[in-house]
């Protein structure tokens, strides 16, 4: 608890102080105080420097002073005998003493007295900046008119702050321009137009004068403008040295002018506005600004376009353009689209056909589709080379967007037929000499693949059964091959309307219109065993003349066996109608007259035995085409005939394209389209 | 019809071979698929091998590989399998069978041959 | 190989009975399934072809059904010529392989 004054004693005092003693007494007056220490008596063992036995005074970290030895006091009115005076109000003594004393020795006694110090003379450090006043325990700061004292209670300054300046346009001085600003101040002035605007300063050189900056070139004086976190400053010195125009770009500033106690000039002066806060006109690469303009400020709007070919991709919806707005913050809405070039993607897989990976899929680049030669091919023209265009789509320039269309190549055997020996007279045959041919296993017979989705067989054979089990691109029929090869399954039957249906289908002696179509559930894929015949085309090139050459194939019955087990085949003349008629019917089930002979059948045969036979029924009567010579088409059906060996009749499918075309054409699927 | 007449019984010892014959007649072998099937005593059927003529080779079941072969004679028109390094277990009746035709798997069986191996 | 697997091993019926045996595959044989039926001594007779297919001259009383893995032959009214052993066999590629056989015995 600090005290107004007290007394110190040695040990034992007025008695010898004891050896090896040391002791020290905290002295504390009350705050304002300095302390007054005086030692009315002092006899203590003398030493060099004190450094036996010793009263040491410690103010801080600072010795007073250190005793020893006899004093008397110097003035007989007083009994003094050593004095300090420390401005402080706190004071330690400490008392040392060592092992051996040569002599008695009494100590010391002293007393300390708090006195009044004068703060505003006995520091170096003035602690007003102003007017300075001493009372008894204390001290207070004053200050000149005009001037208030800050909350520090020390510093006096002049109320400059706390202005806002929210118009468009204004002047700021500073505290009596042009006359001496106030030393010792901090003045600030707030500067906030609406968001969208940013402040710009203007400033004359002439309407500056401020205290000069030391040698270290830092301003005693400054001015500082702050705007977020841009600042610009500190500026000081006779003459404006900043940029006379400042863009803040920034809707807020702060100005801060700080005075410290010295040199005082007339100050500054200046003018701000508001601008627009203007937009960097970007460069957006491959696009176009809608309107052009030199700058743009804020509310401005643009339509940014890309060029042909480029596109704003935005999640997943592309587009060609966007609007962007000049914003107040100076930065334009929607700066993070861009016009990229435009992606087709990945092009689209065609159905017996393939694409290359392309390089790239964007804008311009090109790629090429191919059909699985030699048994597809490009039905739709076009070349198959498509480019990516600026609409995102891969176009072709015959058929634009659409997709080329590989379709079946149709007549053209992987390998050419020879017979090796004189159906019934045949030869064996290879699958891919008839690519075509179809094989029925109830009842026995065959058909002609004409494209993926059709067959085209004789209506006799599917008239029984609607449901036929087929099946493509084996030489055999043996149930171990059948297995490997492809099973065909119907999806309907269409007879021709023309074919008379009988209760007792046994009896038939009109075959007339013996052609039917069988619609497959799934597309045949074709290869060197599968591949479809053509149909006969509609001119008179293809109406056939006596003695033109045709091919058949089939599992029919042979000289030896009732069912062949490997395709039997043999190559036929056209006969005339009545080469039919003349023969006897084998196993006639009416009377021979009733036998029906039409315009729609081909009469074929009588040549060294070679003939089809039955289980051969529905197969192709192939011949060459007369405008290609390296393509067959179906020229006829195995159909009926009187005898096995001698003549057979065919139906004549030229007679049927109109049928078998329209029907295709109602019953396809949008896969086919 | 195809008629298939197979050679007689045999007894064979551990370890011996054994060849059996199967005549085809009313067709050629070379329009036929020759396969071998056995069954032992009380057991069931188990397919031996075949030989395919549109591939020109002999397939022959996992278990069999190594220890038969299938042959054929076609002036004759006999086909033939040969079993190996017999054992117990091969005791059986083995028949020779046609393939069938348009999903028939088997269209005659041989009469059987029977061969027993015992020591 | 294709595993063929027949259930059940032993089936007791009487004459007039519906009777089911089903023959499942290892793996997908599309519709190449046969059933065939053996008689003591004799050789397998075959009955279904083709997983439906009646072979000509077997009574309409058996019937085939299924495709890829399961596959059932029906007898819809047993008769005394019908109590014997009954295989299935797959044909869909080499190695052909049979099922271990149900015998269908008098109850």
């Known amino acids: 608890e600090p005290t107004m004054y007290g007394e110190i004693l040695s040990p034992n005092y007025p008695q010898a102080y004891p050896s090896e003693v040391e002791k020290s007494w905290d002295i504390e007056v009350p705050e304002g105080y300095g302390i007054h220490l005086y030692f009315t008596h002092l006899d203590i063992e003398l030493s060099e420097n004190c450094a036996y036995d010793s009263v040491q005074i410690i103010s801080g970290d600072t010795e007073e002073g250190r005793l020893c030895g006899q004093r008397s006091s110097n003035n007989p009115h007083s009994p003094i005998v050593e004095e300090f005076q420390v401005p402080y109000n706190k004071l330690q003594v400490i008392f040392k003493s060592d092992f051996s004393n040569e002599e008695r020795f009494t100590g010391f006694a002293a007393y300390y007295v708090a006195t009044d110090i004068n703060e505003c003379t006995d520091f170096v450090d003035v602690p007003c900046s102003h007017f300075c006043n001493n009372f008894i325990g204390g001290y207070f700061c004053s200050c000149p008119p005009e001037y208030f004292l800050h909350d520090d209670m020390k510093n006096c300054g002049v109320n400059c702050s706390g202005d806002v300046f929210t118009a468009l346009i204004g002047e700021i001085a500073s505290p009596n321009y042009p006359k001496p600003y106030p030393e010792n101040s901090r003045c600030e002035y707030q500067i906030r137009l609406e968001k969208g605007f940013q402040v710009v300063v203007t400033l004359r050189r002439e309407d500056f004068d401020v205290e000069a900056a030391d040698s270290a070139g830092n301003c005693l004086d400054s001015l500082v403008f702050v705007a977020g976190d841009r600042q610009f400053g500190p500026y000081c010195g006779h003459g404006f040295p900043g940029p006379l125009n400042i863009e803040t770009k920034s809707n807020a500033l702060d100005i801060i002018f700080q005075t410290d106690l010295t040199g005082q000039k007339k100050g500054w002066k200046l003018r701000y506005h508001g601008d627009p806060m203007p937009c960097p006109k970007e460069d957006t690469p491959n696009s176009v600004w809608e309107p052009a303009k030199a700058k743009y400020v804020f509310r401005d709007v643009v339509q940014i376009t890309c060029l042909d070919g480029f596109e704003v991709v935005e999640g997943r919806v592309g587009a060609t353009s966007f609007y962007s707005t000049c914003q107040s913050n100076g930065k334009w809405s929607n700066s993070k689209l861009k016009c990229q070039p435009v992606d087709c993607g990945i092009p689209e897989s065609i159905e017996n056909g393939k694409v290359e990976d392309p390089e790239s899929t964007l804008f311009g680049s090109v790629i090429r589709y191919t059909c699985e030669e030699p048994y597809y091919y490009m039905e739709n023209g076009g070349g198959g080379e498509y480019h990516c265009a600026g609409n995102g789509s891969w176009v072709n320039e015959v058929l634009g967007p659409e997709l080329p269309k590989c379709v079946p190549v149709c007549g053209v055997p992987r390998e050419p037929f020879e017979e090796k020996q004189r159906i019934i007279g045949g030869s064996d045959a290879d699958i891919k000499n008839f690519p075509w041919q179809v094989f029925f296993d109830n009842p026995w017979a065959g058909g002609a693949l004409i494209n993926e989705y059709w067959v085209l067989t004789a209506a006799h054979v599917v008239e029984g059964n609607r449901e036929p089990t087929m099946y493509v691109g084996s030489t055999s029929v043996q149930t171990s091959r059948l297995a490997k090869s492809k099973m065909l399954t119907p999806e309907h039957v269409f007879i021709h309307p023309g074919w008379k249906l009988l209760e007792v289908p046994e009896g038939r002696t009109n075959f007339d219109n013996d052609i039917a179509l069988v619609r497959l559930k799934d597309p045949v894929k074709m290869g060197p065993t599968v591949s479809p015949i053509c149909l006969p085309g509609t001119s008179s090139d293809y109406n056939l003349m006596d003695g033109d050459l045709g091919l058949i194939s089939g599992w029919g019955r042979t000289e030896k066996r009732d069912r062949a087990v490997r395709l039997k085949a043999a190559r036929l003349p056209v006969a005339p109608l009545r080469k039919c008629k003349e023969v006897k019917v084998e196993k006639p089930t009416a009377d021979a007259e009733a036998y029906v002979f039409t315009p729609n059948m081909i009469c074929a045969g009588g040549e060294k035995g070679m003939d089809s036979c039955k289980g051969d029924s529905g197969g192709a009567f192939a011949v060459q085409d007369p405008n290609d010579k390296t393509k067959f088409y179906a020229a006829g059906l195995v159909s009926w005939g009187p005898q096995c060996g001698t003549y057979g009749l065919y139906t004549r499918v030229k007679n049927y394209v109109d049928w078998i075309m329209k029907t295709m054409q109602e019953n396809s699927t949008p896969r086919e389209d | 019809q195809v008629q298939l007449v197979q050679s007689g019984a045999e007894v064979k010892k551990p370890g011996a071979s054994v060849k059996v014959s199967c005549k085809v007649s009313?067709?050629?072998?070379?329009?036929?698929?020759m396969h071998w099937v056995r069954q032992a005593p009380g057991k069931g059927l188990e397919w031996m091998g075949t030989?395919?003529?549109?591939?020109?080779?002999?397939i022959y079941a996992q278990k069999f590989q190594g220890r038969v072969t299938m042959t054929e004679d076609t002036s004759t028109d006999t086909a033939y399998m040969e079993l190996s390094s017999l054992r117990s277990e091969d005791t059986a009746v083995y028949y020779c069978?046609?393939?069938?035709?348009?999903?028939?798997?088997?269209?005659?069986w041989g009469q059987g041959t029977l061969v027993t191996v015992s020591s | 190989d294709i595993q063929m697997t027949q259930s059940p091993s032993t089936l007791s019926a009487s004459v007039g009975d519906r009777v089911t045996i089903t023959c499942r595959a290892s793996?997908?044989?599309?519709?190449?399934l046969a059933w065939y039926q053996q008689k003591p001594g004799k050789a397998p007779k075959l009955l279904i072809y083709?997983?439906?297919s009646l072979e000509s001259g077997v009574p309409s009383r058996f019937s085939g059904s299924g495709s890829g893995t399961e596959f059932t032959l029906t007898i819809s009214s047993l008769q005394p010529d019908d109590f014997a052993t009954y295989y299935c066999?797959?044909?869909?590629?080499?190695?052909?392989?049979f099922g271990q056989g149900t015998k269908v015995e008098i109850k």
């Open positions: 069978v046609t393939e069938g035709l348009a999903g028939r798997p088997f269209d005659s």
């Open positions: 009313g067709d050629t072998l070379t329009e036929l698929s």
């Open positions: 030989f395919d003529p549109e591939e020109g080779e002999t």
């Open positions: 793996q997908s044989i599309s519709s190449w």
């Open positions: 083709k997983a439906s």
């Open positions: 066999q797959q044909y869909n590629s080499y190695s052909w392989t």
